[in-house]
């Protein structure tokens, strides 16, 4: 092909090529043609004769102002036609007359201000019609009943001011899953406008200045329709009362989006008319007081998003939002509750009472004063089958005994990014009989004891990154009870002392993060009592991160038991010479990171076993000694391996001898070296 289109599997991509005409030299069997972002002004039908197999044609982002009706005659199998971001202004009855097989027609962002006659009457198979971002002043798309298979009608960002039944009755035989009318200036819903549509399941009126009064009228118009999903995000609905959604009493609404409304007052029984509602989005509002009956009637809601819904008006404590006790008691089916990023004063004794099906609760950054978790904090969740609890970013400084004793079903507890500073007696976790993961990373300090985790033997994941961990060298190890542990993160703790039994019995451990500590002394032969073999017995370990520990020595048998190791990161240490056979047992190794060490020599006797099945190697920024003895074997291996070695050309440079300084390692000439064959 003379054009620079890329063709693969009957798909031709000719986008962004500044084309002024349709290429005439593409394979004739292509089914998808992308001509977007070019300089096409016309689509001559004759140019498409050879592409009769096309099912999808995308000519968006061009300057097409007119369509030849014959185009679709040449493309009898066309199903998807995308004309977005062009300069179409007129659509005649002939324009799409031959496009009878279309299922999708995209006319977004053109200059269509009015639809005359019936340009879409032949589109009996059309499922999606996108006319958003045009200048349409009404929803009138024809004069007779048509588009009986249409499911999505997208009319957002137009200039529609009223919905009238006489304009929408062309959809009398349609079942619209989505009627998208967002970002219009709708001021009127004429009587029966939605009843003119055969069946309407989804209505989207985001960014429409409805306000409480027009919202109420809208809901009355929706009465006795098939409406299931209603989105009224950013519609200036500042208050709701027990009449706002009254009209929805005669519907089976299952999804309601009231996000971004600056909603201030949620009156009692506002949603009493929505017993079928399952998904309720209330995020980014400004509710000052949630009354005990504000959510009354929402018996079937399974998902409720209250993220950033309760925010304080001023610095004054008096202006903090209030949630009455028992406010959630009506939500008997609620499974997922998001209350992130709020300014709620605290947790009251009956705040969550009645949530008998709650499984996921996010309280991240939710409270202004939740400094201490007591044995009363979560009492209102005692009858909830909670599986996941997120308490991050709440400035929690202390967990008292039995704080979670009410949460016997809990599987994941996230306490990260707080200010917890205490000795962990183990009583904090009492009652967590099904716990799977505890995330404690990024806290102030944690002092461990032999019983810190004695009561949670089911724990499989424990995250203790950057918690100024104390007493980790006690014996028996604080981790001794955790025989089911698969992931342990102890990174960023500046740990300098550990015993060889710290990880004893953790035979199921698969991931161990020890990066950014100070473990160098433990592997020195000069260490009193010899090197500490703290990795022994970890026969199922898959990932080991030891980056940034200051290691300048590795004992020869330190990885001996790690038969299943797949990834090892020893980057940013001070390693120079590694003992021969140090990696002999790492037969499963897939990724090895030794970047930014002091390695000068890469010899077969050391690295041969490790490199055998590698898929990724990182040894960048090491001061390689470019001599036959030091790197000949490595260079030959590099040039024959399929292993991915990022930045090989630029960051694997010789340091010595002086005349090779800065020279790329891979270009080192090994032809004069003896016995440097990488594979035998």
């Amino acid at each position: 092909s003379t054009t620079k289109c890329t063709v693969s599997h009957e798909v031709a991509d000719c986008s962004h090529l500044k084309l002024t005409q349709v290429p005439d030299d593409l394979p004739t069997n292509i089914t998808v043609l992308n001509l977007t972002h070019n300089q096409l002004r016309r689509l001559p039908a004759a140019n498409f004769t050879r592409y009769s197999q096309l099912t999808s044609l995308d000519v968006g982002f061009n300057t097409i102002s007119k369509l030849e009706p014959e185009l679709c005659q040449k493309l009898p199998m066309l199903k998807v036609l995308n004309l977005q971001h062009n300069e179409l202004s007129q659509l005649s009855d002939k324009t799409f007359a031959f496009c009878t097989n279309l299922t999708e027609l995209h006319l977004m962002s053109n200059s269509i201000q009015k639809i005359k006659n019936n340009p879409f009457v032949k589109q009996k198979n059309l499922i999606t019609l996108d006319l958003s971002h045009n200048g349409l002043s009404s929803t009138k798309l024809g004069t007779q009943v048509q588009l009986e298979n249409l499911q999505e009608l997208l009319l957002s960002n137009n200039k529609i001011q009223a919905l009238k039944s006489e304009e929408l009755d062309i959809f009398a035989n349609s079942s619209l899953k989505k009627l998208e009318l967002s970002s219009n200036q709708i001021k009127e819903f004429s009587p029966g406008c939605f009843h003119a549509i055969g069946r309407l399941f989804g209505l989207f009126l985001n960014n429409v200045q409805l306000g409480p009064s027009l919202t109420e009228k809208l809901c009355l118009e929706l009465a006795n329709t098939s409406i299931r999903n209603l989105s009224l995000s950013n519609s200036q609905l500042s208050t709701t009362s027990n009449t706002t959604f009254l009209g929805l009493k005669w519907t089976n609404l299952t999804m309601l989006d009231l996000s971004y409304n600056n909603l201030n007052v949620v009156g009692n029984d506002s949603f009493a008319w929505l017993p079928q509602l399952e998904y309720f989005f209330l995020e980014y509002n400004n509710i000052q007081h949630l009354f005990s009956h504000s959510l009354h009637g929402l018996f079937n809601v399974r998902y409720l998003n209250l993220k950033r819904s309760f925010t304080k008006q001023s610095i004054s404590l008096a202006s903090l939002p209030k949630i009455d006790d028992f406010s959630f008691q009506w939500l008997k089916c609620l499974e997922h509750l998001n209350m992130e990023d709020n300014d709620i004063p605290g947790i009251k004794s009956n705040m969550f009472t009645g949530l008998i099906n709650l499984k996921y609760l996010s309280l991240s950054n939710s409270f202004t004063s939740l400094r201490t978790l007591t044995n009363e904090t979560f009492v209102s969740l005692a009858h909830s089958p909670l599986h996941i609890l997120n308490l991050t970013k709440n400035k929690i400084s202390k967990i008292e005994s039995d704080a979670f004793s009410w949460l016997g079903h809990l599987e994941v507890l996230d306490l990260g990014l707080n200010e917890i500073g205490q000795e962990l007696t183990g009583q904090e976790w009492r009652g967590l009989e099904n716990i799977f993961e505890i995330y404690l990373s990024y806290n102030k300090y944690l002092q461990l004891t032999r019983n810190s985790f004695a009561l949670v033997p089911s724990l499989q994941r424990l995250m203790l990154r950057r918690v100024a961990l104390k007493n980790v060298d006690s014996s028996p190890s604080p981790f001794q009870p955790l025989r089911n542990l698969t992931i342990l993160d102890l990174s960023n703790n500046n740990i300098a002392n550990i015993n060889d039994d710290m990880l004893e019995g953790l035979e199921k451990l698969e991931i161990l993060d020890l990066q950014h500590n100070n473990l160098a002394r433990l592997w020195k032969h000069a260490n009193p009592g010899g090197p500490i073999y703290f990795l022994k017995g970890l026969s199922h370990l898959h990932i080991l991160n030891l980056e940034s520990n200051g290691f300048d020595e590795i004992p020869v048998e330190v990885f001996k038991d790690l038969f299943e190791l797949k990834i090892i990161d020893l980057g940013l240490n001070n390693l120079n010479t590694l003992p021969a056979s140090v990696f002999n047992n790492q037969v499963s190794l897939k990724s090895l990171n030794l970047q930014k060490n002091l390695i000068t020599s890469v010899e077969k006797k050391v690295f041969g076993p490790a490199f055998r099945n590698l898929t990724e190697l990182d040894m960048r920024f090491n001061p390689f000694d470019c001599t036959c003895e030091s790197i000949a074997w490595f260079v030959n291996w590099i040039n024959e391996t399929h292993t991915n070695i990022p930045e090989l050309s630029s960051h694997y440079l010789c340091n010595t001898p002086p005349h090779y300084h800065g020279f790329p390692v891979r270009l080192f000439d090994t032809s004069s070296c003896k016995d440097s064959a990488p594979f035998e």
Epitope: G426, P457, D500, E504
Partner: antibody
Framework: QVQLVQSGAEVKKPGASVKVSCKAS????????IHWVRQAPGQGLEWMGE????????NYNEKFKTRVTMTRDTSISTAYMELSRLRSDDTAVYYC????????????WGQGTLVTVSS | DIQMTQSPSSLSASVGDRVTITCRAS??????LAWYQQKPGKVPKLLIY???TLADGVPSRFSGSGSGTDFTLTISSLQPEDVATYYC?????????FGGGTKVEIK
């Protein structure tokens, strides 16, 4: 199933030493600490110390620290408790015990070894 | 070292009676307390751990309560086979001391 089998009864003279063995089976010997507890005739139970069979690390009860030595032989899954400078009030049944999945309890005990100290 | 004080040192009760034994620690041991039953000439048998959790195979008439320093073992309806000496033991920090024992007899 977990079993701890101890050596037979011993009679010792004051000033002598006694070495009691505890052979473990039914689990990986090196993964659980072994504890030693004694009980004088008609008296209560007294915790003497614990040993990590994996590396031999020991935590002793200060009361016995100068006289007791705990060791192990991983090749035969056996722990030992040796008490030296025996006195008549060391006459007792000596038990080895092991924690369970919950490390704050002794669900597993040896059958006990009676050590009699008599001149 | 934490001392464990058990009371009473002995008690006599009738079959079917509710029996209560208490154990007091000289310091906070949280809930790291176990109760054992020992019959004459036998090995101690675990009844309860973590103050209130019943060990496998132990009849439900046995129950434990308490936290911190004060703990209780209760036999809701004394049976002839419950004649034994009962010991508490803490597991907070070494040495893991035992209480002096409570001898339970049938009237």
């Amino acid at each position: 199933q977990v079993q701890l089998v101890q050596s037979g009864a011993e009679v010792k003279k004051p000033g002598a030493s006694v070495k009691v063995s505890c052979k473990a089976s039914g689990y990986t010997f090196t993964t659980y600490w072994i504890h030693w507890v004694r009980q004088a005739p008609g008296q209560g139970l007294e915790w003497m110390g614990e040993i990590n069979p994996n590396n031999g690390r020991i935590n002793y009860n200060e009361k016995f620290k100068t006289r007791v030595t705990m060791t192990r032989d991983t090749s035969i899954s056996t722990a030992y408790m040796e008490l030296s400078r025996l006195r008549s009030d060391d006459t007792a049944v000596y038990y080895c015990a092991r924690v369970g999945v919950m490390i704050t309890t002794f669900p597993y005990w040896g059958q006990g070894t009676l050590v009699t100290v008599s001149s | 070292d934490i001392q464990m004080t058990q009371s009473p040192s002995s008690l006599s009760a009738s079959v079917g009676d509710r029996v209560t034994i208490t154990c007091r620690a000289s310091g906070n041991i949280h809930n790291y307390l176990a109760w054992y039953q020992q019959k004459p000439g036998k090995v101690p048998k675990l009844l309860i751990y973590n103050a209130k959790t019943l060990a496998d195979g132990v009849p439900s008439r046995f129950s434990g309560s308490g936290s911190g320093t004060d703990f209780t073992l209760t036999i809701s309806s004394l049976q002839p086979e419950d004649v034994a000496t009962y010991y508490c033991q803490h597991f907070w920090s070494t040495p893991f001391t035992f209480g002096g024992g409570t001898k339970v007899e049938i009237k």
